[in-house]
């Protein structure tokens, strides 16, 4: 007996071939001997089976002695043995229909779990193997679960169902809802405008939800909400914003925030959360602000940074085109009695400059000028 695997919702074509290459009488029946379809001369006739409106054939092949049974919009319950009667002989085909579905929405938040459920006909014993977009293989029986979804799990999952040495392949598109970056850091000189961007790692036609940016300033004892906003069909509208600082927010995606001035009291880290409509849980992105200030007070040239810096970052003061006068893994450095000229304050990581501020030291009789 020939075995054919089909997919729920798909179309399957069961073949039946006569030795004579011409149109002759044929009938397709199910295991209960109920006629599905056949022919009367060159006319297609249909029987009383429940497949009636979903069964068809190809008249174009009859003249070549081929009498296919086409079943459209397959259902699991179409799994059966189908019998083709032609030329006083019977051809039997066993059809097994499988379905594979994500038992939740296919749009899942980062960190959530994905469960794939296999629908199969009674008496079958299929095995399933799925390959994620990043090449990770998972195996299972009727259900397969993947916990802690990551951004790289977004894309097409290819699942192969094996039964009777035959296989059928399913493709399921999974979208992991997340920000492109889990964390970002912005380095700014005091007084500069600060731009925070929160690009999403997915695109959907309609995006609705609400969000908030909580900020923990380095100098503050507790965090505070800087801004709350709504998102409706990818349009952003601000609900509430603090007076200090007075953030501005872009009206379109990607989410974009502007801080008019980088000041030491704003240095710190924030957490932007986005709650999407019809989703449990929230998307998170951490954002950090490091602010640098270079000053000269009387005979003391000082460079300071505020905000979350790693211990391996180096803070240096140097006269232009000369060796660093002072270099420390600290958040403040200074030079006493600095000689006149253009001084540079540098924050660097393994030789790569992250932030620099220049200050001009004038001869002792005049006041310093900050460019």
């Amino acid at each position: 007996k020939k075995v054919v695997l089909g997919k729920k919702g798909d179309t399957v074509e069961l073949t039946c071939t006569a030795s004579q290459k011409k149109s002759i009488q044929f009938h397709w029946k199910n295991s209960n001997q109920i006629k599905i379809l056949g022919n009367q001369g060159s006319f297609l006739t249909k029987g009383p089976s429940k497949l009636n409106d979903r069964a068809d054939s190809r008249r174009s092949l009859w003249d070549q002695g081929n009498f296919p049974l086409i079943i459209k919009n397959l259902k699991i319950e179409d799994s059966d043995t189908y019998i083709c009667e032609v030329e006083d002989q019977k051809e039997e085909v066993q059809l097994l229909v499988f379905g594979l579905t994500a038992n939740s929405d296919t749009h899942l938040l980062q960190g959530q779990s994905l469960t794939l459920t296999l629908e199969s006909p009674p008496g079958s014993s299929p095995s399933v193997q799925c390959r994620s977009p990043r090449g990770k293989n998972i195996q299972g029986g009727k259900t397969l679960s993947v916990s802690q979804l990551e951004l790289q799990d977004s894309g097409t999952w290819t699942c192969t169902v094996l039964q009777n040495q035959k296989k059928v392949e399913f493709k399921i598109d999974i979208v992991v809802l997340a920000f492109q970056k889990a964390s970002s850091i912005v380095y700014k000189k005091e007084g500069e405008q600060v731009e925070f961007s929160f690009p999403l790692a997915f695109t959907v036609e309609k995006l609705t939800g609400s969000g908030e940016l909580w900020w923990q300033a380095e100098r503050a004892s507790s965090s505070k909400s800087w801004i709350t906003f709504d998102l409706k069909n990818k349009e952003v509208s601000v609900k509430r914003v603090t007076q200090d600082p007075k953030l501005q927010m872009g009206k379109k995606l990607p989410l974009h925030l502007t801080l008019p001035q980088a000041l030491p009291q704003y240095a710190g880290s924030g957490n932007l959360t986005l709650a999407l409509e019809a989703k449990t849980g929230k998307l998170h992105q951490e954002v950090n602000l490091v602010v640098m200030r270079a000053t000269q007070l009387q005979k003391n040239l000082t460079c300071e940074v505020w905000g979350p810096t790693s211990p391996k970052l180096m803070l240096s003061l140097k006269l232009e085109n000369k060796e660093a006068k002072v270099s420390k893994r600290e958040k403040a450095v200074w030079v006493l009695n600095p000689e006149a000229g253009m001084w540079q304050c540098l924050l660097s990581d393994s030789g790569q400059v992250l932030l620099e501020s220049n200050i001009k030291v004038l001869p002792t009789w005049s006041t310093p000028v900050q460019p």
Epitope: D10, T11, E13, D56, S57, R58, S60, E169
Partner: antibody, heavy 118, light 107 residues
Framework: EVQLVESGGGLVKPGGSLRLSCAAS????????MHWVRQAPGKGLEWVSA????????YYADSVKGRFTISRDDSKNTLYLQMNSLKTEDTAVYYC???????????WGRGTLVTVSS | DIQMTQSPSSLSASVGDRVTITCRAS??????LAWYQQKPGKAPKLLIY???TLESGVPSRFSGSGSGTDFTLTISSLQPEDFATYYC?????????FGGGTKVEIK
Amino acid sequence: EVQLVESGGGLVKPGGSLRLSCAASGFAFSSHWMHWVRQAPGKGLEWVSAISGNGDNSYYADSVKGRFTISRDDSKNTLYLQMNSLKTEDTAVYYCARDRAPEYFDLWGRGTLVTVSS
Amino acid sequence: DIQMTQSPSSLSASVGDRVTITCRASQGIDSWLAWYQQKPGKAPKLLIYAASTLESGVPSRFSGSGSGTDFTLTISSLQPEDFATYYCQQAYSFPLTFGGGTKVEIK
């Protein structure tokens, strides 16, 4: 998105060869028969070739039999038409079309223009 | 080969008119027939299959009838977007064949 996108058309001299491709997406390509249909400039539609879902059987119009070969690669969701010994009368927009079963075309590509001229 | 003959080859009509296009097969083809609509520079679009079954998403003003050798496509009330060329196609035997087309123009 359910779609078919043809490519590979262009200008070729009589007697030359060309291979057309049709990339399918958004549906179960392997379970559908596929067809090529052409349309000469300012003229009607002409069926060219068909291939069964499993790729075992193919069918051709008399005008292209022996010169054209239809094939499919289900792993790439792609349909092909290898056109050899091209004639000026093969000049047309070539469409790939999905078979609704039986032999009705419910999804078409935008077409690719093949010009056979010396 | 089965020849499909459409008539008329072109017609002029106004919005709101009832339009009938006929298709004749050179031999009996039972109900193995489809109708397509094609607009300039676009791919054809399936309207009706199995002679009278309306494809999903196609407006109900389109209808098909006939069996054997004579078939009809009717547009009950012509709309501006219906001005196009219409083709019939038989699925009775290979080679599959199309009618020559009927161009529906604005009067």
